[in-house]
Interface confidence: medium
């Protein structure tokens, strides 16, 4: 199962989620780790 792992010890406040690539800007879409605490793919 592919999971995000939150390694911060506090509540994560997200930016707006995007679920379709048409909503991803050509630059923003390539950024990895916008979450507080970072992102790890299991």
């Amino acid at each position: 199962d592919a999971e995000f792992r939150h390694d911060s010890g506090y509540e994560v406040h997200h930016q707006k989620l995007v679920f379709f690539a048409e909503d991803v800007g050509s630059n923003k879409g390539a950024i990895i780790g916008l979450m507080v605490g970072g992102v790890v793919i299991a």
Partner: antibody, heavy 124, light 112 residues
Framework: DVQLQESGPGLVKPSQSLSLTCTVT?????????WNWIRQFPGNKLEWMGY???????SYNPSLKSRISITRDTSKNQFFLQLNSVTTEDSATYYC?????????????????WGQGTLVTVSA | DIVMTQAAFSNPVTLGTSVSISCRSS???????????LYWYLQKPGQSPQLLIY???NLASGVPDRFSSSGSGTDFTLRISRVEAEDVGVYYC?????????FGAGTKLELK
Amino acid sequence: DVQLQESGPGLVKPSQSLSLTCTVTGYSITSDYAWNWIRQFPGNKLEWMGYIDYSGITSYNPSLKSRISITRDTSKNQFFLQLNSVTTEDSATYYCARISGLDYDVRAGWFASWGQGTLVTVSA
Amino acid sequence: DIVMTQAAFSNPVTLGTSVSISCRSSKSLLHSNGITYLYWYLQKPGQSPQLLIYQMSNLASGVPDRFSSSGSGTDFTLRISRVEAEDVGVYYCAQNLERPLTFGAGTKLELK
């Protein structure tokens, strides 16, 4: 480990509403991700129906938009599908599934966890 | 909607040999960010679908490296080398370039 389980009536009459529940264990539906309904028709065709994300925002397949509603009960960690005015064409196995968001990592827009599915037959 | 096209069946495969499964999209799935939004799922008999490949060529966690995927913007191939009995099932391609997310009709892998 997150687990999803669908439940609801297996038989619905034409013109009535189909209502299903997905119970999520091992993860809070308000913490992250989007929580989807997908159905599989006889013959294996898969159709994405829509989702409700962790913040309560919904997105629906335009082909169903006039008939579908996805809601949630955060206190029970459940989300729900309501499909109105059903016909025999809505007979299918209905899955709930979790998908993560492209905003966090562009690699992650996939269905990572699925329920086992529940068969719904529409018949008089 | 983007239409995903797959053959209903693969040629029957002998254990230990290789097989390729094809998928075609009605529109290029290559985004301006350089990523191709094509996924492969396997649905084993009696089970829910499971992810094999994400964004055209990346192997999902826990998937054996016997599986690989390649393609252009519209034509894609899933290759299984050294087919095992547990690989039997229906293989679906899917896209999330545009809403609604759409799946192919599935290709059934059968053994000789």
